[in-house]
């Protein structure tokens, strides 16, 4: 009874032996192949890992656990059947062979068997719980993986969509760039063609201008000749009239020819009694060379020799060094008297310079320099000014000290650029300086923001092109 032993037989079946007095009871129980033997150590946390398992691994292990559970279940069922069968047989045997007092032993054995069964069942339940626990964990992980996968898939889809959009945009932009490049090439070709045409046109115009200049020179010469002839004719007529009157009044027909008087400047003309504004012939100092100049006999006491006038844009002031030297234009309109004459004139005595200006709003102003002269050509007709007064600015708009004269073909300024070519006209440019009264003539409403216009900075600023200008000189002791 108390001698209860458990062992394994040679074929791997579990063997239960109960010794009670002279009787010995042996129970043979089948052992499932896939079940863990009770003697093998059981690690309860073997399947409960913290680190997530690889998906395929988890599925595989789950299948193994399911198989184990199924096998355990089958084993239990077999055990129950076996016990029932054995119990029936044993009961029959006991009823037939054993004495009544063996019943208690049998009950005890049954109880033990039931206890064993219960233990096995508890263990199986424990395994099942663990399997369920692990299954739940795996299911959660699978769910998490699934969600994560979905999220990643969504992100990938979004990114793919974004990439597609960008690719579309890129291809659109590429097309646009190519189109622009094509357009640009066409425009460049067009500009080049235009440039070539303009160059042809410019060269044509240059040749036309040269022809016109030649014609103008010829016309001027012819005009001078005609004027001289007219003057000589008038003189002859006057002489004839004098002769006629003399021959009528006296018997002695001797003609007293009037001595020809020459004037150096308009001050001398004025002092000789000619007090009307107009064009007069002046003579170079210490020379017989003559020049025509406009004399202002009214403004500020008269006697002013006009050396420059701008009023309507009728004369081109972008001229050569030689033209600025000898003078150009029409003395009754726009003209430049000539640097050589002014240099020689101001070399003889002290002169004052008055610059009279008009804007497009009806305002007038002037700058008066008490001392003025031009150096010789050798010193590039450098301007010398001193003693500024007047209403056209307290600071001189002609840079001080004076600068050399510059033209399109005679660059004597203090700029690395060529001021005369850039701003047009000949002038005493600095670099390039606050004035240029020989700049481009701009009509009204086109006269602002012009860097190359008729400029007098300290009266109207840098971008304002004036309506009219007059530069005039007179001896300081007039």
């Amino acid at each position: 009874y108390n001698n209860f032993r458990k062992s394994m037989d040679s074929i791997g079946k579990k063997q239960y032996q109960v010794q009670h007095g002279s009787c010995s009871y042996t129970f043979l129980l089948p052992e499932m192949d896939n079940c863990r033997s009770s003697s093998s150590p059981y690690v309860s946390n073997a399947v409960q890992r913290d680190a997530p398992l690889e998906y395929d691994d988890s599925v595989q292990r789950l299948q193994v656990l399911e198989n184990i559970m199924e096998n355990n279940t089958q084993w239990l069922m077999k055990l129950e059947n076996y016990i029932q069968d054995n119990m029936k047989k044993e009961m029959v045997e006991i009823q037939q062979n054993a004495v009544q007092n063996q019943t208690a032993v049998m009950i005890e054995i049954g109880t033990n068997l039931l206890n064993q069964t219960a233990e096995q069942t508890r263990k199986l339940t424990d395994v099942e719980a663990q399997v369920l626990n692990q299954t739940t964990r795996l299911e959660l992980q699978l769910l998490e993986h699934s969600l994560s996968t979905n999220k990643l898939e969504k992100q990938i889809l979004d990114q793919t969509s974004e990439i597609n959009k960008l690719q579309d945009k890129n291809s659109f932009l590429e097309k646009k760039v190519l189109a622009m490049e094509d357009k640009h090439i066409i425009q460049l070709q067009s500009i080049k063609e235009e440039k070539d045409q303009l160059q042809v046109l410019v060269s044509k115009q240059n040749s036309i201008i040269e022809e016109l200049e030649k014609k103008i020179v010829t016309a001027t010469v012819n005009n001078s000749v005609l004027q001289k002839q007219q003057h000589d004719l008038m003189e002859t007529v006057n002489n004839l009239l004098t002769m006629m009157s003399t021959s009528n009044s006296a018997k002695d027909p001797t003609v007293a020819k009037e001595e020809q008087i020459s004037f150096r400047d308009c001050a001398e003309v004025f002092k000789s009694g000619h007090t009307t504004n107009g064009i007069y012939t002046l003579t170079f100092p210490n020379s017989t060379e003559e020049i025509k100049a406009y004399c202002d006999m009214e403004a500020g006491g008269g006697g002013w020799t006009i050396i420059q006038r701008r009023e309507d844009g009728s004369v081109d002031f972008q001229r050569t060094w030689k033209e600025y030297k000898v003078g150009f234009g029409n003395p009754s309109g726009e003209y430049w008297l000539g640097n050589e004459f002014v240099s020689q004139l101001t070399n003889q005595q002290r002169y004052v310079l008055k610059i009279h200006l008009k804007d497009w709003e009806g305002n007038e102003a002037y700058s008066l320099y008490e001392h003025f002269y031009l150096s010789s050509e050798e010193l590039n007709y450098r301007i010398h000014l001193k003693g500024l007064t007047g209403t056209a600015g307290k600071i001189s708009s002609i840079s001080q000290p004076g600068n050399d004269f510059s033209t399109k073909d005679g660059d004597n300024d203090k700029c690395i650029c060529k001021c005369s070519q850039m701003l047009t006209g000949g002038w005493w440019f600095d670099a390039c300086g606050p004035s240029n009264l020989n700049g481009m003539y701009y009509p009204q409403r086109q006269n602002t923001n012009k860097f190359n216009g008729i400029k007098w900075y300290y009266w109207k600023g840098s971008g304002y092109s004036l309506k009219a200008t007059t530069m005039m000189i007179r001896p300081a002791d007039f």
Epitope: P285, N347, Q349, H371, Y373, E378, L379, R382, H384
Partner: nanobody, 120 residues
Amino acid sequence: EVQLVESGGGLVQAGGSLRLSCAASGRTISSSVLGWFRQAPGKEREFVAAISGSGSSTDSAKDRFTISRDNAKNTVYLQMNSLKPEDTAVYYCAAGRAFLTRDPFYYDIWGQGTQVTVSS
């Protein structure tokens, strides 16, 4: 281009004499007025004497300084006698207008100057 080169300057005892020369190169200056100016340290440029093409002259110290010119040699001279320590300065030669003037404004060609030092 016209250039004026002065010479004849140097160190001299008070009461002594010096003759400055100014030679023009580049072109003839027979019609131009030629003048002498001087500038002492810390002072403004001062007129000394001038001579026209025809030989008319004006000076600030007639008794001591005499200006003359040789148009053939294209040269102007300044004879300085009875020199005083206050005559110490850099002496400049200048060419200007055809009219006589003491105003340096009307002289547009200048030499580099020559130092005259009068010691007491």
